[in-house]
Amino acid sequence: TIQGTNRSSKGRSLIGKVDGTSHVTGKGVTVETVFSVDEFSASVLTGKLTTVFLPIVYTIVFVVGLPSNGMALWVFLFRTKKKHPAVIYMANLALADLLSVIWFPLKIAYHIHGNNWIYGEALCNVLIGFFYGNMYCSILFMTCLSVQRYWVIVNPMGHSRKKANIAIGISLAIWLLILLVTIPLYVVKQTIFIPALNITTCHDVLPEQLLVGDMFNYFLSLAIGVFLFPAFLTASAYVLMIRMLRSSAMDENSEKKRKRAIKLIVTVLAMYLICFTPSNLLLVVHYFLIKSQGQSHVYALYIVALCLSTLNSCIDPFVYYFVSHDFRDHAKNALLCRSVRTVKQMQVSLTSKKHSRKSSSYSSSSTTVKTSY
């Protein structure tokens, strides 16, 4: 966002004051509360970064994220019999991604049309609430999944209903927490008309009084509580997991597990480096600069960081792939345009031909869940 301050207000999140109504007079519009942005912010709002680069990235995220997370949710809900904690966390992760990604066509259209929001105040608030909600949900569910994966290695007990119930309880608590922490994003006026550019922005220009203090405090609190603390837990879980895997016996099966664990760790690390760290860092820096200087010199970086944060919806399916045997099979089959039933039939005939017990290790039954690496 830039700060938009009100003329009695001008803008740049760009800063400004709320309650701007307007009425048309001949060619132009007479505004009751005017938000004027600085030249740098205006160049960002009208430049190729926001009108070409962002829609391209969001289109990729939508095209990749919608089907992959949709399939993941379907697999976890309907093709996985035993709902292990990992499955529950991944199902929630996929749901969070879907709830964010479904609004992307509006976001893409908004940027393509020069950052002009024509879909009304309510839809803008929903889009922004879900946008940030997805990021913080992803961080928290990823933390739960990471801690759970470590727990499975330390404590390799069988599936229990109690563990699944605990995971469901934690998931509901996370959704409730995210709903509560994103309330300010739904309540605050997010759409603002910029007379100089003849556009109505959604979240890119926000009211001055709000931004100066409250937004900095808000995003700083979220960065500490919902990013840094979970990131520390995730990192700790993976460091301990690597130690455990190093010291464990090295048969062929555990070597496979170790490789998949490393792939998972690399994927989660990439997600933090690309999606979560830049966005949370720049949210704080951006709003700090507005609070202290009245304008943000990192606005373009902040825009890019927030855009890259949406890539988590494309990276999450790789997490499902390295954790869930079921998702792995469905993903492979979907990519090869084969049905699971066909693959099963092939495996059954293979098994009957070989009369070998070993062949069952290739089985990818969709009725059993293997959340091991």
Partner: antibody, heavy 119, light 106 residues
Amino acid sequence: QVQLQESGPGLVKPSETLSLTCTVSGFSLNSYGVIWIRQPPGKGLEWIGVIWGNGNTYYNPSLKSRVTISVDTSKNQFSLKLSSVTAADTAVYYCARWRGYKDYPFDYWGQGTLVTVSS
Amino acid sequence: EIVLTQSPATLSLSPGERATLSCKASQNIYKYLDWYQQKPGQAPRLLIYNTNSLHTGIPARFSGSGSGRDFTLTISSLEPEDFAVYYCLQHNSGWTFGGGTKVEIK
């Protein structure tokens, strides 16, 4: 070079409408707008309203019920109309160029035109 | 509405002396303050914009400083043509002019 020139009647009767024109040259009306400012004799400066190059306007809340600012791009002119004038509206009226962005000042001004409201 | 208070109202100095004009805002306006010079019968002329940026063609003896609420215009060595009225203008939230400071010959 950049030039702004205010013109209009020097005398207006109370309750009538004051009409002024600001003719500009040396810059594009697509990129710049103007702000109207007035200065009562021996007093300070007060802004009246602003118009962007795209025709959007914003008026001083204390005057907005009486003010209309418009642009005629074909003539390179901005106009100011102030209705129901009183003696308190007697002032030198200036138009000044503005880029329309927060960090831009009013860099070029017209020489001003004195408008007296009297019967 | 933001109020700008200029002081002193009148500054009596001799040519060659240093002039320091003050402008105080009722709330934080960051760097968004400009200085204008006005001579009798003339339109105001922009000197300094955004606190300390010198406008094209303005002599280097004019300089601006400050941030937040307190701002200063300094004329390092007064020339005869510098005796005029100086206005500050804030454009962080709306537009407000200060009451002016008259710099007169002592």
